[in-house]
């Protein structure tokens, strides 16, 4: 519970955080798990303990590992473990994914990448920036503290973005990069009157005595976040949950966004053990939101079994 | 929200044990560790001890020790404080609580609603 | 064991006035915590980390200090602030509270 994943490149810089937390005053002892060996305090070590930070300076491929960090509060003592890759540096331009920092997204309003990790090295302005290998120039990037803005992004601003910073350790210079993937997303959202994709309206829909039934609710709003948008199914012009049938429930389905853009949801209405009364009420699909309220009613008809002898 | 259910009202007699309960709802059990605060009638707080339900393990006021025992049940997010050998000082109201960021230390943010334990003959 | 010592142990101040409760410790600790007790209620932890106001607790409280010396203040005197304040230490096992301030309104 308490783990986290870190790493990095050899012969960089690689700063990793107890996975605990603490008051800035307790004591923080690190270990390498698999020889339980302390890790030194001595900043004259490449690899040294600082209070609930453990430095690799460089790093080195053999650093990888699980290290544990016990922070002693004055009534427990509390276990972190931080799990270390450190791997061998790439001939080519290509960031495998294991490198990868969390993705970002950004729009024309919204267009900051923050270096990722930067807040635990002692470092100092310009940060470099690339993208795809390639060193940013021009106008429209800007590298401002921890983060680069990009000016008027367009959708061909996606891609892995690399930042690019000196860690200072007693006079001492290592280099750190840390890539994470910029997304572009399109601000233009719309909203409009509900579409029930399904079910048809008036449909009859067959069921077996005794088996089960479900029927789904599907409707689309608009395109982008929609600010109120819902689906829900009623029976006999009454709310599931006050109708009162255990063997009648519904149940939220996935938020769908197809490839059109449009944002839709779905309802399923589950019928346990389908009896002769069901068929005598009716089942409305509602799909509402801003801009009003759709209602596609289904029946139930009973479906004859197979006769197999015939 | 966070909330802790405390057991009811008891009353004991010299020599006995009791055992309080404290149900936690609200968050994840296992992520803080909960901490008894007694208080006697007209007095102040006093810190019994506290154990972590991830691991078992306990904390103790050495004023306490050996007398109180602390468990956690994962199963049912439950916090226990059984105290043996009652004398009629013990009588106070148990509270069990915890800390809002738990690593942090920063103050007992949450508490039960407190468990009145008398001691008579 | 570190002992708390809170004074006054008792006072009584009208609506509006400005309120200083004081709590020395036996040894230097690194933080402290202030509560508030109504009767027959549960404590409320008001100030933590010795000057952070917790979370939905109006602005009038505030606390500081550092060391063996600290000080809880109410800038101005409400009569929902009748009650019995506490201060507390988390430096050290066993963890301490004061004896506690009991605040009237006159």
């Known amino acids: 519970k308490f783990s986290k994943q870190s790493w990095g490149l050899e012969n960089e810089a690689l700063i990793v955080r107890c996975p605990r937390q603490g008051k800035p005053s307790y004591t923080v002892d690190w270990y390498y798990s698999q020889t339980n060996k302390s890790i030194p305090t001595q900043e004259r070590n490449r690899v040294f303990a600082s209070g609930q930070l453990l430095k690799f300076l460089p790093a080195a491929v053999a650093d990888s590992g699980i290290y544990t960090c016990i922070v002693r509060s004055p009534t427990f003592n509390r276990t972190g473990y931080a799990n270390v890759t450190i791997y061998k540096k790439q001939s080519d331009c290509n960031v495998p994914d294991y490198l990868m920092y969390s993705t970002v997204s950004g729009s024309e309003k919204n267009s900051k990448i923050y270096c990722p990790t930067i807040d635990l090295y002692n470092w100092t302005a310009p940060l470099e920036w690339f993208k795809n290998c390639q060193a940013l120039q021009g106008s429209r990037y800007r590298a401002h503290k921890s983060f680069l803005v990009i000016d008027n992004v367009m959708t061909e601003d996606a891609g892995d973005y690399t930042c690019k910073f000196i860690h200072n350790e007693n006079g001492a210079n290592y280099s750190v990069t840390a890539t994470r993937s910029f997304t572009v997303k399109d601000e233009q959202g719309f909203s409009l009157f509900p579409v029930i994709g399904a079910p048809a309206q008036n449909e009859i829909k067959e069921v077996e005595i005794g088996k089960n039934a479900n029927l789904t609710c599907s409707a689309c709003f608009g395109k982008g976040t929609q600010f109120l948008a819902a689906v829900l199914w009623q029976l006999n012009g009454t709310k599931i949950t006050d109708f009162g049938e255990p063997r009648i429930q519904q149940e939220e389905g996935q938020n769908q966004s197809f490839s059109n853009g449009l944002a839709c949801l779905d309802m399923v209405l589950r019928i346990a053990d389908v009896k002769e009364e069901d068929l005598l009420l009716q089942y409305d699909c509602l799909a509402l939101n801003l801009h009003g309220l759709r209602r596609h009613t289904v029946r139930l008809s009973r479906k004859n079994p197979i006769d197999h002898h015939s | 929200q966070v909330q802790l259910v405390q057991s009811g009202a008891e009353v004991k007699k010299p020599g006995a044990s009791v055992k309080v309960s404290c149900k936690a709802s609200g968050y994840t059990f296992t992520d803080s560790e909960m901490y008894w605060v007694r208080q006697a009638p007209g007095q102040g707080l006093e810190w019994m001890g506290a154990i972590d339900p991830e691991t078992g393990d306990t904390a103790f006021n050495q004023k306490f020790k050996g007398r109180v025992t602390m468990t956690a049940d994962k199963s049912t997010s439950t916090a226990y404080m059984e105290l043996s050998s009652l004398r009629s000082e013990d009588t106070a109201v148990y509270y069990c609580?915890?800390?809002?960021?738990?690593?942090?230390?920063?103050?007992?943010?949450?508490w039960g609603q407190g468990t009145m334990v008398t001691v008579s003959s | 064991d570190i002992q708390m010592t809170q004074s006054p142990s008792s006072l009584s101040a009208s609506v509006g006035d400005r309120v200083t409760i004081t709590c020395s410790a036996s040894?230097?600790?690194?933080?402290m915590h202030w509560y508030q007790q109504k009767p027959g209620k549960a404590p409320k932890r008001l100030i933590y980390?010795?000057?952070k106001l917790a979370s939905g607790v109006p602005s009038r409280f505030s606390g500081s200090g550092s060391g063996t010396d600290y000080t809880f203040t109410i800038s101005s005197l409400q009569p929902e602030d009748a009650a019995t304040y506490y201060c507390q230490q988390w430096s050290s096992n066993p963890l301490t509270f004061g004896q506690g301030t009991k605040l009237e309104i006159k």
């Open positions: 609580t915890r800390a809002f960021d738990n690593d942090n230390d920063d103050g007992f943010a949450y």
């Open positions: 980390d010795t000057s």
């Open positions: 040894s230097s600790v690194n933080y």
